[in-house]
């Protein structure tokens, strides 16, 4: 048993048919010793009495918010929560499992440049009884800080008959230094509460592998004379990085006709502007990475051909 | 090149070579972001490699205040994984396919460190580990965490003399 | 084609030593290894070691603790073991074998025992 | 050293009908999590092995009756129709760690 915060505890409970579960002895925060009882949520059933409460916690029923009292007034709470490991391997039921870039990806993380900050979100179909906390850090062993905001609710989708939630955070190094090369990684740790459950997920990452930049902005075209060729240029996003001398990206260029099935063309370019052939019906969309580290390209930047 | 008394090196040139780096570490090894090495005793094995730091100077200002730190923090480097890429690591069994990146990722490892360091002139370099993995699947394992952390000094190089070519070149 | 081709059969002492040739042809000697493999009678296969002639490196079952040598010859593409102290349950079929162990980038590990000798029998008696 | 133990010892099936192998080692021999160092080989009488599964590949020439399957320390190989040809004994390797080590060896026969 561990505490979560002032008067939540999480106990850690080996889950499998007839488990003996975990002895509990709950204190009551009070200089009182005589007279006390206790009940369990909105029970009046007294569990027991005197300053301390010994408990077996086994399952769900035996969790929730256990209160002395004395003469009718309340004297202190205790909430306790339960954390399931079965087969050695802790619950992971509140969260779903996002399966990019691979399995048992719960948590997922992206940032537009090297400032240090970066915004992590996680998707669930519980709607109610549901509570976040998130803490990050650089570094496990000697951390150095990183601050995150509160989670909330950025997005609700229809899948099929179910409803999916999205979570995000936004998070800050406080001394971030964007042109260093990262020796240690960040760790997000997101604690869930849905009910009585406790359950935990952690991600590790260097802020380079997260990167993603905004996409290009002011994508325009120029038409040459007697030709059908156009040049097309844009610019950095504006949350990119400075200077762009420093921190450069480079560019996917692409022609894509109606159809999806048509061939596409594509050129890789580093300057922010290029010459293509504009077909009719076509649209031209241009995308951004890092030049020098392949981390994610952003989403496309799309103007249509006529 | 990088004189000795800080003269300015051949920051085109280093532009070019280093860009080059950063394609031949990412085709050396594109899928080692998506390896799942965590299972394998994942011991920190490459925490003695230079990383260029905060204060080295390698941001854009520390380079207009005097570029020479950060290059020798780079020359370091570059020697470093010079060493490693041609140590029992790589040369080792499984041995590496004669067409892999590998080869001229180290030979261009040397050739920019000679273009940021004359012959003759010594900026003192970091001590190699001695890593001689005793089974194959170590070296493995190593080789991706080396060419893992290259992949990120080589990108700090390059944005260096990427800036330094834009900003700095007489 | 690829022809790994042993030394003749041998007779040995206790105590003695016995050296196994294997004479390789058809293929590039220094671009793979050699791996040495044994069977006694009626028995499943046992690795003892194998050299790889381009990095120099050679690596052993420790079971043999010192009593084994792997070399090779890269100037006349031949590998040797050598098995020293040698004791009666040493009798067996011994093999070499080319080894192909290489990384790529799509297959981080290969390796291939894939040509053979046609096997030495040593037996140890008194 | 990692230990492979082979079952069964010996194997008999009728011509057509599917035989299974089974290894199992005392560590896994996967490699970042999906790459196997596991590899089969068959022994017929009088011959010397033949690599006939590398990893999780067939080697060419071998026909594809033979599937191989499994990773971190339970592998299978199976002979989906037997023919006559399968008589031999098929043991497995891993090269993982070093002392490489074989099973004990699985013999198949005809019923």
């Known amino acids: 048993i561990w505490e979560l915060k002032k008067d939540v505890y999480v106990v850690e409970l080996d889950w499998y048919p007839d488990a003996p579960g975990e002895m509990v002895v709950l204190t009551c925060d009070t200089p009182e010793e005589d007279g006390i009882t206790w009940t369990l949520d909105q029970s009046s059933e007294v569990l027991g009495s005197g300053k301390t409460l010994t408990i077996q916690v086994k399952e769900f029923g035996d969790a929730g918010q256990y209160t002395c009292h004395k003469g009718g007034e309340v004297l202190s709470h205790s909430l306790l929560l339960l954390h399931k490991k079965e087969d050695g391997i802790w619950s992971t039921d509140i969260l779903k499992d996002q399966k990019e870039p691979k399995n048992k990806t719960f948590l997922r993380c992206e940032a537009k440049n090297y400032s240090g900050r970066f915004t992590c979100w996680w998707l669930t179909t519980i709607s109610t009884d549901l509570t976040f906390s998130v803490k990050s850090s650089r570094g496990s062993s000697d951390p150095q800080g990183v601050t995150c905001g509160a989670a909330t609710l950025s997005a609700e989708r229809v899948r099929g008959d179910n409803k999916e939630y999205e979570y995000s955070v936004e998070c800050q190094e406080d001394s971030a230094c964007p042109a260093a090369e990262e020796s240690l990684p960040i760790e997000v740790m997101v604690d869930a509460v849905h009910k009585l459950k406790y359950e935990n997920y952690t991600s590790s990452f260097f802020i380079r592998d997260i990167i993603k930049p905004d996409p290009p902005k002011n994508l325009q075209l120029k038409p040459l004379k007697n030709s059908r060729q156009v040049e097309v240029s844009w610019e950095y996003p504006d949350t990119w990085s400075t200077p762009h001398s420093y921190f450069s990206l480079t560019f996917c260029v692409q022609v894509q006709g109606k159809s999806k099935r048509e061939k596409k063309d594509r050129v890789f370019t580093d300057k922010t502007s290029a010459t293509v052939i504009c077909r009719k019906n076509a649209s031209i969309s241009v995308r951004a990475q890092d030049r020098y580290y392949s981390s994610s390209w952003s989403e496309w930047a799309s103007v249509p051909c006529s | 090149r990088a004189v000795p008394g800080g003269s300015s090196p051949a920051w085109t040139q280093c532009q070019q070579l280093s860009q080059k780096l950063c394609t031949l570490a990412w085709s050396a090894h594109p899928l080692v972001g998506h390896m799942d090495l965590r299972e394998e005793g994942d011991e920190e094995t490459t925490n003695d490699v230079p990383h260029i730091q905060c204060g080295d100077g390698c941001d854009p200002q520390g380079l207009r205040d005097n570029s020479q730190f950060c290059l020798q923090r780079i020359h370091q480097g570059l020697i470093f994984y010079e060493k490693l890429l041609g140590s029992d690591i790589f040369t080792g069994e499984p041995s590496l396919l004669p067409d892999s990146p590998v080869g001229q990722l180290h030979a261009s490892l040397l050739g920019l460190s000679q273009l940021l360091q004359p012959e003759g002139h010594h900026w003192e370099t970091q001590q190699i580990p001695s890593l001689s993995p005793s089974q194959p699947w170590q070296r493995l394992l190593l080789r991706f965490k080396i060419l893992r952390s290259l992949q990120a000094f080589v990108a700090v190089a390059a944005r260096v003399f990427a800036h330094g070519a834009a900003t700095l070149s007489p | 084609q690829v022809q790994l081709v042993q030394s003749g059969a041998e007779v040995k002492k206790p105590g003695s030593s016995v050296k196994v040739s294997c004479k390789a042809s058809g293929y590039t000697f220094a671009s793979y290894g050699i791996t040495w493999v044994r069977q006694a009678p009626g028995q499943g296969l046992e690795w003892m070691g194998e050299?790889?002639?381009?990095?120099?490196?050679?690596y052993y079952n420790e079971k043999f603790k010192g009593r084994v040598t792997i070399t090779a010859d890269k100037s006349t593409s031949t590998a040797y073991m050598e098995l020293s102290s040698l004791r009666s349950e040493d009798t067996a079929m011994y093999y070499c074998?080319?080894?192909?162990?290489?990384?790529?980038?799509?297959?981080?590990?290969?390796?291939?025992?894939?040509?053979w000798g046609q096997g030495t029998l040593v037996t140890v008696s008194s | 050293d990692i230990v492979m133990t082979q079952s069964p010892d010996s194997l008999a099936v009728s011509l057509g009908e599917r035989a299974t192998i089974n290894c199992k080692a005392s560590k896994k021999v996967t490699i970042f999590g999906s790459t196997s160092a596991l590899h089969w080989y068959q022994q017929k009488p009088g011959q010397p092995p033949k690599l006939i599964y590398n990893?999780?590949k067939l080697e060419s020439g071998v026909p594809d009756r033979f599937s191989g399957s499994g990773s971190g320390t339970d592998f299978t190989l199976t002979i989906s129709s037997l023919q006559a040809e399968d008589v031999a004994v098929y043991y497995c390797l891993q090269n993982k760690e070093v002392p490489y080590t074989f099973g004990g060896g699985t013999k198949v026969e005809i019923k």
């Open positions: 990893g999780a």
């Open positions: 050299n790889y002639p381009r990095s120099g490196n050679t």
């Open positions: 074998a080319r080894a192909e162990f290489i990384s790529t980038v799509v297959a981080p590990y290969y390796y291939a025992l894939d040509y």
